[in-house]
Every structure is written in structure tokens, then in C-alpha cells.
């Protein structure tokens, strides 16, 4: 009896021979139809099975099909070499339905009670196949109650019939040089219903050829070409194949930078596919050839296409494009096989003409006017009036194209003016007032602007001087007129130089006493040391010995003289250095204010009056000689005094330099 | 002491040819590594470079102005002469001309202004 | 023509540090320039490829160059180096300038 088409209910039951379990009658004949629903099977086993034993079950038999097919026929009560009986075995039907037909004939020759059988529908694992089958899935296949469904591994796609997986092959677009494809799971067998599209797409100018590589086994047939699975190639020229067999297809020169390739499969068949290597061609430029002193990386047989080189210069030369220095050269080679530059020049290395050096010169040692790679000049300082500083002034042209020195410094050496020189040497004993003779006091500086002062050459470009002596002009340093090189006060032959900056000391307070009078004025040009231009030396930290008290110092200038006027020839007077206390104890009393001689400054002079600086004389120096390195130096800046110049019992005070050391260097070295 | 010197008219007439000397002292035209440059510089704007020649005679012109632009030298007289066509406003720059070595402008002249205007 | 790119302005107080820079593409495979100009003045060349001092040009000057940045530094900035920058790059043989920078040093 079949079920409804619903299967409302759970499909088991029972079926048994009639009059079960009392024997059964002859000429029965029953026929039993079981349907499970799409998906299920029939399960069948008996509790009880006796029937008429006969030869291949001819009288009485229980016989189950499943649609045309007889699963079982059965008699008996045990199995027998040529018959039936179900003993424990349980049956399947194939599909969703079972047919039981039982039958006894016209006789028996003893009682028999037949049988009884119960059946139930189950779930048809359509997954589990028996071996040598085909699969039911080509990849992976899930039961469920009722079904199956097959699903695929990634990079693959679920045909339309549901079962076969065809491989997501198309698109792969390969533009690289040289590389590799092959078929899907090669050397695998290659998936079914699968159609595979590869292009390989280089820069136009190149050209792609194929090799097939390894194996090449794509289902053929013995008569028509590739009716089943097949490989195309296709360029922009022409199509080469369709390719199946065993057989390695020839290499193909595409003569193309696009080429297709073309894998198409059906659903049978079990072979292993194709792999194929590409390279890639192109029309080669001319080999380069390395300039001299240059050499070519990477070295290559040939240069096509995208290939490129770089120059590389031996130490000691650059690369120059025309006259231009080049950072680094690559060259490219294009498609019409030309490189997309020209071939550069390893050139020497040329540091140039050296830079002149103020108040030196230089010589060429490698030869005349030689300034390239390694090349030698020598620095050296005008003699007598410079020194040079820094280094032994010996260059060398280094790779850089610097000239550089053998403690590798690229600035120029220095040629400091030495200081301190005089044509005057002390007779250590106190003269009167005098006249310097030319190249007594080189060093001494005229300052005319709006007063008469002096000051003190340092160095080539800066003068010393008193910062009463130059307070007004500080905002509008052009306005000094300042005069070197000359003996006489109002002579027309001198060296003229010019303010750039004025520096006040930043402690001086102008008419409030004279601590910290001093200042540095900046020229605007360095002037020429020669025996009448010198500068003054400062004191070095060992000077406090050469200015004790009693030591003798020599003032120079132009100021007021016995008579009252400025002097017209440059006078010099010898003084010595008076005991600091003694000096403040002649200051403390009116008119002086209190304290007016500080630690800052020095005094000068004899107790008995008579030689002194005086007005005119401000901002001059105070010089002693350093006897170790037989140079004069700056000890002292005139600044103030009594009213009336060389008094009896009053100095000249001076500003003590030694104090102001740091002071000037900083100045100097900023500006 | 390396110099240059540019000279030419302070007035030009749209549509004319300006036509500027560059005289150069110091470093020579025709031998070395060297070469001069002619750059302008628009009022408030930036430095424009125009064109170079090298020692041996190699030019090179800026690409946009390269149909208007030619340069050449007179090794004899230490002159470079720029000559630039069909004048218009736009052009009213200072124009300098400079020293190049070692791929760097190194000396500099002190630039003539030139005006174009009717 | 390639263009080379600079900021307009720049600011720093004495004795800082100022920083320009010139960005342009593969600026750093070419030598760079750097010049300084004064108002009313010519421009001076402050470095050349990438890194050298022309002499009488301050050591407080330094420039570097790499990728797509050079870049000009100016260490304990003073009221003098106030005034226009400009990179300068050589592309084949023709000569490409910076927009320019200028540099103020405050008060």
C-alpha cells in the first residue's frame, strides 16, 4: 500500500505471510509495495523467516526488488550453496521504494509458518559510495535528512548540474617578465566543465615566447581533433592550436606582448594537464660601453627592453652629463632598442682655483695651475706681519672637490696678523714725555667724531678703545673717522678705516663713573698689517705677571701735552703701575665720589706727578712687554684721571683688559 | 675676482627683441668646466631660469620660452648675449646673468631691470 | 618643466634652528642648490650638491637631500640670514628653481 504523497507520518511497519504464525496455505501469491520519501531508503529484516526449501527457490520464495532490479529471492530456513534464507541480513531498497512479492506453490510437503519482516524508511547517506564508484560530489559532499548537496574548495565554482566543481580560472593577467602557468592542480588531474582564460600582457616592445614544460596530458581523441579538452593560444597576430595528447607542443615566438591562453574541459576524464614557462624578448640596445675611469653595473650579455645600467666613477672623478655634475646615471633601454640617455663622462674630480687667502698666498706644488683629483697647494702667510693659524696650510684636491687639509678641514687657513711688534724697545727706566718714532706704536689708533680719542688696533679688523671716548657715536658708528699708520695728528698720509658696529660694554653707564669703560669698534674692512699697522697683542692669562706694581707700561697718543695742546707728533710716555689700595686712597677724597676706582680698572703714574695720559689720549693703550714672548700687550685703556693731567699724588686710571678677556673674545667671535 | 655684468635697454616695447650683454671677468669662456646663465626674476616673484652656454658652445633653453630665446658668446670680448623675441608686460623682470660651475650658479651679476611697456 | 615646491614662509627666533624645505619628485636622485637672496641684492649660493659650502658661506648653512625632499637648515639662525631662499635642480640640462622661502627672524 503506498503512503500519501505527504509522508505525514513516520514510514516503519510490519508485514508477515498470511495466517502468520500458522503455517500459510499453498497457491498464496502477495505483493507488497513500500514507497519512503525522496531522499530515504527502505530498511527490511526478518524476525522469522520458514519456507519450502527448493532449488534456486522455484516452489515457495519471498522476493525483493527495488524498482527493476531483485535485491533478494528467499526460501528455506538456512542458506544453502545455490538458495536464500535472510537469516540476520538486513536489506536495502536502491531507491525511495521496495517491492515484497511473496509466493507458495500447488503444494508442500510439510507444514511451513512462513514469515515475518519489519521495515522502516532512513536517511540515504548519498555521500557514502561503494568502491570504484564515482563520487557523488567532485569535492566535498554534506548529507542531510532527505538530501545532499556538493560544494567546492575555494577557487572553485558549483556547476549548474550541481555535482561538478569547474575551476575559477579565468582572469589571471601575468606581466612580468618571465613566469610560469600551468593547468588548474597540475600536475593533479585538471577540474572538469571548467573553462580557463590566462593572459599574459608585457610593455609593448616586448615579445613572449612559450615553452611547455615538465608533462603535457590533455584528453584527446584518435580521430577528431581535441573534440573534448583542448588549449588555444591567441595572440594579436594569430591563433596557435587547439593542443591535447601526450605529446609537448613545440615552443611558440609569439612575435606579441599580449598573448591568451585558452584551457577549455568536459565533464570526464582524468589527466594531469600542461605547464608552460614564458620569457620575453625585446629588440636589445647597443651594449654600453663604460667611459673611461668609469665602469658599468650590472654587467649583462645583453640589454633589452626595461633593462638599465648605472655608471659608476673610479675615486677621484664625477659624473658629468655635459658639463653638468650628475648625483648618479641610469640609463633605460627603450623599445625602439635606443637608451633613453647618453653615455656620461667620468670626469676628474677639479677643485678649482683655490680661493685666495687675505694677507697670504698660494703656490701650486703638483704643478702649475694644477687644481684636480690629489693635486698639492701650499698656503703660506705674508712674513713678519701674519701667521698662519689652524693648519701647516698644505691642501689637497680631495674626491669631494674640495681642497682639503691634512687635518681635513675645507676652510681656508687663517693668516692672523701677529701682534705686538715694535720698533721700541724699553730702556726700563722712567722718561718724560717723547715723541714715538715711526713703528714705535703700530698699533695706535686715531678716532676723530666730534672729539679727539685713540684706541688700540686687535687683529686686522677690530680697534680697542675706551667707551667714553666713542658713547656718542654708538648708534652711528659711520660717523668715526678713524686714522692708522701715521705719526703726525693732522697728516694728510694715512691709512683711512671706517665703523661698521660700535660695541659698548654693557655694564658701562655713561657719566655715572667709569667702570667697564670700554669698547670694541668693528671695521668694515681689514686693514693691511705692515711695520707702521700692528696690532696690539691681548694679555694672555700669565700677563698679571709683567704688570705688577712698579712695572712699567708706556701710554701713547695725541692728547693735551704740558702746554695745553693736543699734540701735533705721537707722544709716548713710560709709567708705572701704582699699588692698587694707594690709588683708591687718592681717589676717596673730594671731589672724587666714593669708590670711584674699582677692581676693574688700574692706575699709572709717579707720586711726584708729571707724566700722565690726558685728554685726547682716552681709549688709547696702556702696553707692556710680555718678556717670555717678547710681544707688547694691552694691559690698560686710559679712561680717567684728575682734572689736572699729571698731578702730584694722582694717576691715570686705566681700564684693567685682563677683566674683560672673555668679554672681547665673545664680541669677536659672534660678529 | 670673478665678475659679471649685465647690460642692455631698461625699456622695451611689447612685441620687440630685447637683446642683453652679459660681460664676464675672472674666469674664462672658453676654457674649463664653466658656463653662464641667464635667470629673471619678475617684481616679488621667484627666480626663472632661461637659458646657459658652456665653454664648448653647448646651450640649453627653458621649454617653455625656447622659440623666443637664443643664446651665444664672444670668447674674445668675454661676452654672452641673451636675446629674447616678441616682448610682452609679462617679461618685465630683473634679468641676471650668473656664473655656473660644479652645477651651482656661483657668481651672480647684479641684475638689470627691464620694463616692457608701449 | 618639473616644479619643486617650498614653503612661503619660515620663522624663527635668534639662535634657533630653521628648517627649509624643497620637495619634487625623485629630488633626491638629482644634486641640490640652495640660494639665499637679500632684498634688493642678487642671490648668494649657500650650498651646493646637496651638502658643500661654498667658501665664505657660515657653517651654521647645511643642506641634505634624499627621496623626494632636500632640505636647507639654518642652526643658531641670526638677524643677518633673514631673506629669500630658493632650491635650485638640474633636470636633463635645463635648470628648475623653488617656489622660494622666506625667512623671517623674529625679533
Known amino acids: 500500500t503506498p503512503l500519501g504523497p505527504k509522508w505525514p507520518e513516520p514510514v516503519f511497519g510490519r508485514l508477515a505471510s498470511p495466517g502468520f504464525p500458522g503455517e500459510y496455505a499453498n497457491d498464496q501469491e502477495r505483493r507488497w509495495t513500500l514507497t519512503a520519501p525522496p531522499g530515504y531508503r527502505l530498511r527490511l529484516y526478518f524476525t522469522h523467516f520458514d519456507l519450502e526449501l527448493s532449488h534456486l527457490c522455484e516452489y515457495d520464495f519471498v522476493k525483493l526488488s527495488s524498482g527493476a532490479k531483485v535485491l533478494a529471492t528467499l526460501c528455506g530456513q538456512e542458506s544453502t550453496d545455490t538458495e536464500r534464507a535472510p537469516g540476520k541480513d538486513t536489506f536495502y531498497s536502491l531507491g525511495s521504494s521496495l517491492d515484497i512479492t511473496f509466493r507458495s506453490d500447488y503444494s508442500n510437503e510439510k507444514p511451513f509458518t512462513g514469515f515475518e519482516a519489519f521495515y522502516a524508511a532512513e536517511d540515504i547517506d548519498e555521500c557514502q559510495v561503494a568502491p570504484g564508484e564515482a563520487p557523488t560530489c567532485d569535492h566535498h559532499c554534506h548529507n542531510h535528512l532527505g538530501g545532499f548537496y556538493c560544494s567546492c574548495r575555494a577557487g572553485y565554482v558549483l556547476h549548474r548540474n550541481k555535482r561538478t566543481c569547474s575551476a575559477l580560472c579565468s582572469g589571471q593577467v601575468f606581466t612580468q617578465r618571465s613566469g610560469e602557468l600551468s593547468s588548474p592542480e597540475y600536475p593533479r588531474p585538471y577540474p572538469k566543465l571548467s573553462s580557463c582564460t590566462y593572459s599574459i600582457s608585457l610593455e609593448e616592445g616586448f615579445s613572449v615566447i612559450l615553452d611547455f614544460v615538465e608533462s603535457f596530458d590533455v584528453e584527446t581523441h584518435p580521430e577528431t581533433l581535441c573534440p573534448y579538452d583542448f588549449l588555444k593560444i591567441q595572440t594579436d597576430r594569430e591563433e596557435h592550436g587547439p593542443f591535447c595528447g601526450k605529446t609537448l607542443p613545440h615552443r611558440i615566438e609569439t612575435k606579441s606582448n599580449t598573448v591568451t591562453i585558452t584551457f577549455v574541459t568536459d565533464e570526464s576524464g582524468d589527466h594531469t594537464g600542461w605547464k608552460i614557462h614564458y620569457t620575453s624578448t625585446a629588440q636589445p640596445c647597443p651594449y654600453p660601453m663604460a667611459p673611461p675611469n668609469g665602469h658599468v653595473s650590472p654587467v649583462q650579455a645583453k640589454y633589452i627592453l626595461k633593462d638599465s645600467f648605472s655608471i659608476f666613477c673610479e675615486t677621484g672623478y664625477e659624473l658629468l652629463q655635459g658639463h653638468l655634475p650628475l648625483k648618479s646615471f641610469t640609463a633605460v633601454c627603450q623599445k625602439d632598442g635606443s637608451w633613453d640617455r647618453p653615455m656620461p663622462a667620468c670626469s676628474i674630480v677639479d677643485c678649482g682655483p683655490p680661493d685666495d687667502l687675505p694677507s697670504g698666498r698660494v703656490e701650486y706644488i703638483t704643478g702649475p695651475g694644477v687644481t684636480t683629483y690629489k693635486a698639492v697647494i701650499q698656503y703660506s702667510c705674508e712674513e713678519t706681519f701674519y701667521t698662519m693659524k689652524v693648519n701647516d696650510g698644505k691642501y689637497v684636491c680631495e674626491a669631494d672637490g674640495f681642497w682639503t687639509s691634512s687635518k681635513g678641514e675645507k676652510s681656508l687657513p687663517v693668516c692672523e696678523p701677529v701682534c705686538g711688534l715694535s720698533a721700541r724697545t724699553t730702556g726700563g727706566r722712567i722718561y718724560g714725555g717723547q715723541k714715538a718714532k715711526p713703528g714705535d706704536f703700530p698699533w695706535q689708533v686715531l678716532i676723530l667724531g666730534g672729539t679727539t680719542a685713540a684706541g688700540a688696533l686687535l687683529y686686522d679688523n677690530w680697534v680697542l678703545t675706551a667707551a667714553h671716548a666713542v658713547y656718542e657715536q654708538k648708534h652711528d658708528a659711520s660717523a668715526l673717522d678713524i686714522r692708522m699708520g701715521t705719526l703726525k695728528r693732522l697728516s694728510p698720509h694715512y691709512t683711512q678705516a671706517w665703523s661698521e658696529a660700535v660695541f659698548i660694554h654693557e655694564g658701562y653707564t655713561h657719566d655715572a663713573g667709569f667702570d667697564n669703560d670700554i669698547a670694541l669698534i668693528k671695521l668694515n674692512n681689514k686693514v693691511v698689517i705692515n711695520s707702521n699697522i700692528t696690532p696690539i697683542c691681548l694679555p694672555r692669562k700669565e700677563a698679571e705677571s709683567f704688570m705688577r706694581t712698579d712695572d712699567i707700561g708706556t701710554a701713547s697718543g695725541w692728547g693735551l701735552t704740558q702746554r695745553g695742546f693736543l699734540a701735533r707728533n705721537l707722544m709716548y710716555v713710560d709709567i708705572p703701575i701704582v699699588d692698587h689700595q694707594k690709588c683708591t686712597a687718592a681717589y676717596e677724597k673730594p671731589p672724587y665720589p666714593r669708590g670711584s676706582v674699582t677692581a676693574n680698572m688700574l692706575c699709572a703714574g709717579l707720586e711726584s706727578g708729571g707724566k700722565d695720559s690726558c685728554r685726547g689720549d682716552s681709549g688709547g693703550a696702556l702696553v707692556f712687554l710680555d718678556s717670555e714672548t717678547e710681544r707688547w700687550f694691552v694691559g690698560g685703556i686710559v679712561s680717567w684721571g684728575s682734572m689736572n693731567c699729571g698731578e702730584a699724588g694722582q694717576y691715570g686710571v686705566y681700564t684693567k683688559v685682563i677683566n674683560y678677556i672673555p668679554w672681547i673674545e665673545n664680541i669677536i667671535s659672534d660678529f | 675676482q670673478v665678475t659679471l655684468k649685465e647690460s642692455g635697454p631698461v625699456l622695451v616695447k611689447p612685441t620687440e627683441t630685447l637683446t642683453l650683454t652679459c660681460t664676464v671677468s675672472?674666469?674664462?669662456?672658453?676654457?674649463?668646466?664653466?658656463?653662464v646663465s641667464w635667470i629673471r626674476q619678475p617684481p616679488g616673484k621667484a627666480l626663472e631660469w632661461l637659458a646657459h652656454?658652456?665653454?664648448?658652445?653647448?646651450?640649453s633653453y627653458r621649454t617653455s620660452l625656447k622659440s623666443r630665446l637664443t643664446i651665444s658668446k664672444d670668447t674674445s670680448k668675454n661676452q654672452v648675449v641673451l636675446t629674447m623675441t616678441n616682448m610682452d608686460p609679462v617679461d618685465t623682470a630683473t634679468y641676471y646673468c650668473?656664473?655656473?660651475?660644479?652645477?651651482?650658479?656661483?657668481?651672480w651679476g647684479q641684475g638689470t631691470l627691464v620694463t616692457v611697456s608701449s | 618643466q618639473p616644479v619643486l615646491t617650498q614653503p612661503p614662509s619660515v620663522s624663527v627666533s635668534p639662535g634657533q634652528t630653521a628648517s627649509i624645505t624643497c620637495s619634487g619628485d625623485?629630488?633626491?636622485?638629482?644634486?641640490a642648490y640652495w640660494y639665499q637672496q637679500k632684498p634688493g641684492h642678487s642671490p648668494v649660493l649657500v650650498i651646493y650638491?646637496?651638502?658643500k659650502r661654498p667658501s665664505g658661506i657660515p657653517g651654521r648653512f647645511s643642506g641634505s637631500n634624499s627621496g623626494n625632499t632636500a632640505t636647507l637648515t639654518i642652526s643658531g639662525t641670526q638677524a643677518m640670514d633673514e631673506a629669500d631662499y630658493y632650491c635650485?635642480?638640474?633636470?636633463?640640462?635645463?635648470?628648475?628653481f623653488g617656489t622660494g622661502t622666506k625667512v623671517t627672524v623674529l625679533a
Open positions: 650668473a656664473r655656473i660651475r660644479r652645477g651651482g650658479i656661483d657668481y
Open positions: 675672472g674666469f674664462s669662456l672658453s676654457r674649463g668646466k664653466m658656463g
Open positions: 652656454i658652456f665653454s664648448s658652445d653647448e646651450k
Open positions: 625623485k629630488l633626491g636622485d638629482k644634486f
Open positions: 650638491q646637496d651638502n
Open positions: 635650485q635642480a638640474w633636470d636633463s640640462s635645463t635648470a628648475v
